[in-house]
C-alpha cells in the first residue's frame, strides 16, 4: 500500500483551508477522549480509479468520497482521517484531513474526495473514514468503512495499468486445442514480442472426480525476433485411460518483467460427449480395477510425450 | 503480552448450535482483521473465516458458508464464531489467530475443542 | 478456488540433513504464501511469510524461496526439535487455504 507520488495531495475548497498530513492511524483524541465529538460521515462511497505518476506510469487508485451530515456537530469537526487496509497482507495506510478553519453551514452540502491511494489488482480492501476528534470510549462510532475489491488484470481498464502490463496483461496468446488421433492433444497459442521461454502444462481430470489422473509440462524454447507474433504449437500424448478425458491447458510465459509471476493463460477440454447410440465400453477401460505396475503407466508421467516445436505462418 | 484465548467449546448433537469467543489482549484489536482456523483430529490445518477490522469484509471457506457466522466487538476486544447446524464433520479444534502485517498469521490462540456427536 | 498441494507428506531423515518441502498452488498467487509449523499437540507457528521473508524469533536455518505457483521451504541442518508438520497456506485472496501438510522426523 502507498501514496501516489502526487505534488502535493490537496483538500482545501472553497470555504475551508485544509491540509493532508501522513498519519500513525492512531489520532491523538483516542488517546486524549474530547467530550464533544461530531457525527460520522455520510454516503461513504469508494470507486476504482485510475492516475498517472511523474514519470507517466499508470496505477489504479481508490476514489473516496463522503459528505456530511447536517447536524450541528460540523462545529466540532477538525478533520477527517482515511484509513485503507489491504485485507490479506493486514497492511494499513493512513492520511488525515487537518482542518485550518472552522466548517460552516453554507447552501451545499459538504462533500470531501481523496483519489492517492494505490491499490492492487485482485486484491481487497476495507476503506474507512473517520471524522476527528474520535468520540470516547463508549461514544457512539463516528466512522463508516466499506469494502472495496479491485478487479484483477482481466479487467479492460487494469490491463493497461504499469502492475498489469508488468505481469503480461497486454499478451493474448489465442490458444486453441485440437484432439488429434491415438490420444493426443494439440495446443497452439500466439507467442509475444519477447524472446522469452514459454511453459505449456497439461493437467486431466475424470469428468466426475476433480483430483489430476493425468499431467504433462512442455517447454518452449526462447523464439528469435522473426518468431515473435507467430504461432507456437506444442503436441501431447494424453493418458490412455479414456475416463482421464476432461484436460486443463495452461500457457505460462517468463517475461523479463514478471519471470515466473506472469499471469497465465487457460483453456479446458471437456470430456466428449457420448450419445446414447454409442456401444459401451467395457467398465474396465473407465475404471482402473488395479495398480498398474511400476514403468507401465502414463499416470504422473513428465516424461517427453510427444513433439514441441514452433509452427510459422508467413 | 499479545494473547488470544478462545472458549465457548464443547460438545454437541449434530444440528446443533455452539457460539465460540476469542477475548484478545496486548494489542490494538481494532487495528486487525481476525481469523478463525480449525483442526479435525489427526487432520491438517484448515481456514474458516476471517473479518476486517471494522467487520465489511467477510468471508468463509464453502464448508462452513450458510451455517457460520463469524463477528467482533472491537470495545470488548473480542472475536466470535457463531455456529449452526453443525455436522460430525465440523468436530476440530477451532482457533483463533491474528494476521501478521506483511501475510500470514503471526499470533494464535490456544485453541477451543468442539466435539459434534450423536 | 486454488488448490494448494505439498509433498512430500512425509519425509524421514537425519540430524544435520538438507531438508526440502515444496508447496504447489493452481495457479499463480504470487509471493502471497506462509509457511508455518506445528508440532503435536501445540498450535501452530509461523516460520515464513511473503514466501521468502523469515519471522522474526525463527532460526536461520529456515528458509523459504519461489513466486507464482512454485515454492519451497529449506531447513539447511535438520534438528531434533524440528520434528513437526510443516504448512503452506496461500493468501493472495480469500479463501486463504492451507497445504495438507508434511511430516518431518527423525530417521
Known amino acids: 500500500l502507498r501514496l501516489l507520488d502526487h505534488r502535493a495531495l490537496v483538500c482545501s475548497q472553497p470555504g475551508l483551508n485544509c491540509t493532508v498530513k501522513n498519519s500513525t492511524c492512531l489520532d491523538d483524541s483516542w488517546i486524549h477522549p474530547r467530550n464533544l465529538t461530531p457525527s460520522s460521515p455520510k454516503d461513504l462511497q469508494i470507486q476504482l480509479h485510475f492516475a498517472h505518476t511523474q514519470q507517466g506510469d499508470l496505477f489504479p487508485v481508490a476514489h473516496i468520497e463522503w459528505t456530511l451530515q447536517t447536524d450541528a456537530s460540523i462545529l466540532y469537526l477538525e478533520g477527517a482521517e482515511l484509513s485503507v487496509l489491504q485485507l490479506n497482507t493486514n497492511e494499513r495506510l493512513c492520511v488525515r484531513f487537518e482542518f485550518l478553519s472552522k466548517l460552516r453551514h453554507h447552501h451545499r452540502r459538504w462533500r470531501f474526495t481523496f483519489s492517492h491511494f494505490v491499490v492492487d489488482p485482485d486484491q481487497e480492501y476495507e476503506v474507512t473514514v473517520h471524522h476527528l476528534p474520535k468520540p470516547i470510549p463508549d461514544g457512539d462510532p463516528n466512522h463508516q468503512s466499506k469494502n472495496f475489491l479491485v478487479p484483477d488484470c482481466e479487467h479492460a481498464r487494469m490491463k493497461v495499468t504499469t502492475p498489469c502490463m508488468s505481469s503480461g496483461s497486454l499478451w493474448d496468446p489465442n490458444i486453441t486445442v485440437e484432439t488429434l488421433e491415438a490420444h493426443q492433444l494439440r495446443v497452439s497459442f500466439t507467442l509475444w514480442n519477447e524472446s522469452t521461454p514459454y511453459q505449456v502444462l497439461l493437467e486431466s481430470f475424470s469428468d466426475s472426480e476433480n483430483h489430476s489422473c493425468f499431467d504433462v509440462v512442455k517447454q518452449i524454447f526462447a523464439p528469435r525476433q522473426e518468431e515473435f507474433h507467430q504461432r507456437a504449437n506444442v503436441t501431447f500424448t494424453l493418458s490412455k485411460f479414456h475416463w482421464c478425458c476432461h484436460h486443463h491447458v495452461q500457457v505460462q510465459p517468463f517475461f523479463s518483467s514478471c519471470l515466473n509471476d506472469c499471469l497465465r493463460h487457460a483453456v479446458t477440454v471437456p470430456c466428449p460427449v457420448i450419445s446414447n447410440t454409442t456401444v459401451p465400453k467395457p467398465v474396465a477401460d473407465y475404471i482402473p480395477l488395479w495398480e498398474p505396475r511400476s514403468g507401465s503407466s502414463d499416470y504422473k508421467d513428465d516424461d517427453d510425450k510427444g513433439s514441441s516445436h514452433h509452427h510459422h505462418h508467413h | 503480552e499479545v494473547q488470544l484465548v478462545e472458549s465457548g467449546g464443547g460438545s454437541v448433537q449434530p444440528g446443533g448450535s455452539l457460539r465460540l469467543s476469542c477475548a484478545a489482549s496486548?494489542?490494538?484489536?481494532?487495528?486487525?482483521?481476525m481469523n478463525w482456523v480449525r483442526q479435525a483430529p489427526g487432520k491438517g490445518l484448515e481456514w474458516v473465516s476471517i473479518?476486517?477490522?471494522?467487520?465489511?469484509?467477510?468471508h468463509y471457506a464453502d464448508s462452513v458458508k450458510g451455517r457460520f457466522t463469524i463477528s467482533r466487538d472491537n470495545a470488548k476486544n473480542s472475536l466470535y464464531l457463531q455456529m449452526n447446524s453443525l455436522r460430525d464433520e465440523d468436530t476440530a479444534v477451532y482457533y483463533c489467530?491474528?494476521?501478521?502485517?506483511?501475510?500470514?498469521?503471526?499470533?494464535w490462540g490456544q485453541g477451543t475443542t468442539v466435539t459434534v456427536s450423536s | 478456488d486454488i488448490q494448494m498441494t505439498q509433498s512430500p507428506s512425509s519425509l524421514s531423515a537425519s540430524v544435520g540433513d538438507r531438508v526440502t518441502i515444496t508447496c504447489r498452488a493452481s495457479?499463480?498467487?504470487?509471493?502471497?504464501l506462509a509457511w508455518y509449523q506445528q508440532k503435536p499437540g501445540k498450535f501452530p507457528e509461523l516460520l515464513i511469510y511473503?514466501?521468502?521473508t523469515l519471522q522474526s524469533g525463527v532460526p536461520s536455518r529456515f528458509s523459504g524461496s519461489g513466486s507464482g505457483t512454485d515454492f519451497t521451504l529449506t531447513i539447511s541442518s535438520l534438528q531434533p526439535e524440528d520434528v513437526a508438520t510443516y504448512y503452506c497456506?496461500?493468501?493472495?485472496?480469500?479463501?486463504?487455504?492451507f497445504g495438507p501438510g508434511t511430516k518431518v522426523d527423525i530417521k
Open positions: 489467530a491474528r494476521p501478521k502485517v506483511g501475510g500470514g498469521m503471526d499470533v
Open positions: 496486548g494489542f490494538t484489536f481494532s487495528s486487525y482483521s
Open positions: 473479518i476486517s477490522s471494522r467487520s465489511s469484509i467477510i
Open positions: 511473503a514466501a521468502s
Open positions: 497456506q496461500k493468501y493472495n485472496r480469500a479463501p486463504f487455504t
Open positions: 495457479q499463480g498467487i504470487s509471493n502471497y
